[in-house]
């Protein structure tokens, strides 16, 4: 997996006019990072993880590059012919990477009630765009205003590209978020699914990186997937992962059934505990 | 039948490495974990830990970390255990098993290393 | 780590009597326990599985028992066959302990 740092601010317009303020997320490696909420912009650090990256250090850069960054989404929303009555978003998700190879990509997308409409290359300035005719008309009016702006030449796309770069190297500097390995927590649970069936759920959670396989196994052997739920792996806020797995049994078979993980070269199995049944909703 | 069929007795010198194998045969290779154990002569039984043949993913045994590295592989559906530094403590008989589920099901016939000058 | 506790050691009896092995642990290990019979220079087979689930092939007179941290293996009516060592593992949580074994000798 590259290390990435991705970007992700959000403006609205309501009948017409941009309304004040941005939403600003930024994610460090997948987690999220930093936050800024819709009226003031103070970039907060998105649990003790993110604090941990840069020690006792200030966000007074982060807060001015976002507050600016929020600054020219909204004038971009505001040059967008087609405004019509209600509520609007404009989105603009930036990203850059840097693989293990040492190499680097950088691309910029644009969304507008959540459909992207523009996205472009930040390192060959390559533009692409949807073929719908709407998306095409969008990209058209925002891309002409862009190149209008005084700022927005091709220094400035080289600079967004290198910025970001800059910051994701600073922040790998911590060695916070430099190839760690956190290997999960494991824990089985059972409920009532119907008469004379249970639902055994396992969960894994503290783990990074988000690579994992989670399964049941019955009598040694891998259950189809058909016979089994997943959810999906989602950022805990600590800077670690967590996902769970389902499958529903007889009552009576919990023996049989083992839930298997395996994460970062490592594996470990869970049985299902004794016990009384928890009468909990399930997930099917 | 399901077989595992291990490698024969070795006897070698104090402060080299051995690789133990574990064929296997009668069953589908990758869809079960294998497991190694060790018994010190007139002693009991250690679990020093499983490989799942299918991914090489491992699961040691602390004690045996850095002394045993485990490796399969699925093209000659045999599972290797690697013993490394060895001292007299090393000697012993190694199993390999199947796991099937929560329990041991198949066993090897025990490979008997000898570490000896 | 779990500890299993293996009783007695070792233990002497005529062919036709009834013995008990038990086995503790040092947590709930919820069942998850198996007995292996081992004869000198061959490896363990498998007795019972899930604390009282016998493996296919093994004679009715062997049964297992118990839960949460005390477990038990009766052979009722021994065979001459039947002597050797016995050990018990638990599967609850890696590390996978066995007991110290169990000695049954002909008297």
């Known amino acids: 997996e590259p290390h990435s740092l991705r970007y992700n601010l959000t403006v609205l317009s309501g009948d017409g006019s941009v309304q004040s303020g941005f939403l600003a997320e930024v994610h460090l490696d997948g987690q999220p990072f930093l936050r800024c909420d819709r009226q003031k912009c103070r970039a907060k650090p998105q649990g003790q993880w993110a604090e941990d990256v840069l020690g006792n250090k200030t966000w007074d850069r982060e807060t001015r590059d976002l507050t600016g960054n929020g600054k020219d989404l909204r004038m971009t929303l505001a040059h967008i012919k087609d405004q019509k009555e209600g509520l609007h978003s404009l989105q603009e998700i930036r990203v850059c990477e840097i693989h293990e190879d040492n190499s680097t990509r950088s691309s910029q997308h644009f969304y507008y009630d959540g459909e992207l409409f523009l996205s472009q290359n930040l390192e060959t300035e390559e533009w692409t765009m949807p073929q719908s005719s709407r998306a095409q008309t969008l990209a058209m009016n925002v891309r002409n205003f862009l190149k209008e702006d005084a700022m927005k030449t091709k220094t400035h796309y080289h600079a967004m590209h290198a910025d970001c770069l800059q910051e994701l190297r600073r922040y790998l500097k911590s060695g916070v978020v430099l190839r760690r390995t956190v290997p999960p927590m494991v824990n089985v649970t059972r409920s009532e699914a119907s008469e004379g069936n249970i639902t055994v759920t396992c969960r894994a959670s503290g783990f990074y990186p988000w690579n994992i396989t989670l399964s049941w196994r019955q009598d040694g052997v891998s259950l189809s997937h058909d016979t089994q739920q997943w959810g999906d792996v989602l950022p805990d806020g600590n800077g670690t992962y967590q996902t769970w797995v389902a499958t529903r049994i007889c009552q009576g078979e919990e023996q049989r059934f083992t839930c298997y993980m395996e994460h970062s070269g490592n594996h470990s199995t869970h049985p299902v505990p004794s016990g009384k049944v928890l009468v909990l909703q399930s997930h099917w | 039948q399901v077989q595992l069929q291990q490698s024969g007795a070795e006897l070698v010198r104090p402060g080299t490495s051995v690789k133990v194998s574990c064929k296997a045969s009668?069953?589908?290779?990758?869809?079960?974990?294998i497991e190694w154990v060790k018994q010190r002569p007139g002693q009991g039984l250690e679990w020093i830990g499983g490989?799942?043949?299918?991914?090489?993913?491992?699961n040691y045994n602390e004690k045996f970390k850095g002394k045993a590295i485990l490796t399969a592989d699925k093209s000659s559906s045999t599972a290797y255990m690697q013993l490394s530094s060895l001292t007299s403590d090393d000697s012993a008989v190694y199993f390999c098993?199947?796991?099937?589920?929560?329990?041991?099901?198949?066993w090897g016939q025990g490979t008997t290393l000898t570490v000896s000058s | 780590d779990i500890l299993l506790t293996q009783s007695p050691a070792s233990l002497s009896a005529s062919v036709g009597e009834t013995v008990t092995i038990t086995c503790r642990a040092s947590?709930?290990?919820?069942?998850?326990l198996a007995w292996y019979q081992q004869k000198q220079g061959k490896s363990p087979q498998l007795l019972v599985y899930h604390a009282k689930t016998l493996a296919d092939g093994v004679p009715s007179r062997f049964s297992g028992s118990g839960s949460g941290t005390q477990y038990s293996l009766k052979i009722n009516s021994l065979q001459p066959e039947d002597f050797g060592s016995y050990y018990c593992q638990h599967f609850w949580s890696t590390p996978w302990t066995f007991g110290g074994g169990t000695k049954l000798e002909i008297k």
């Open positions: 947590g709930n290990i919820h069942n998850y």
């Open positions: 098993a199947r796991l099937d589920g929560n329990y041991v099901g198949y």
């Open positions: 009668g069953y589908a290779f990758t869809d079960y974990l």
């Open positions: 490989i799942n043949p299918g991914s090489g993913s491992t």
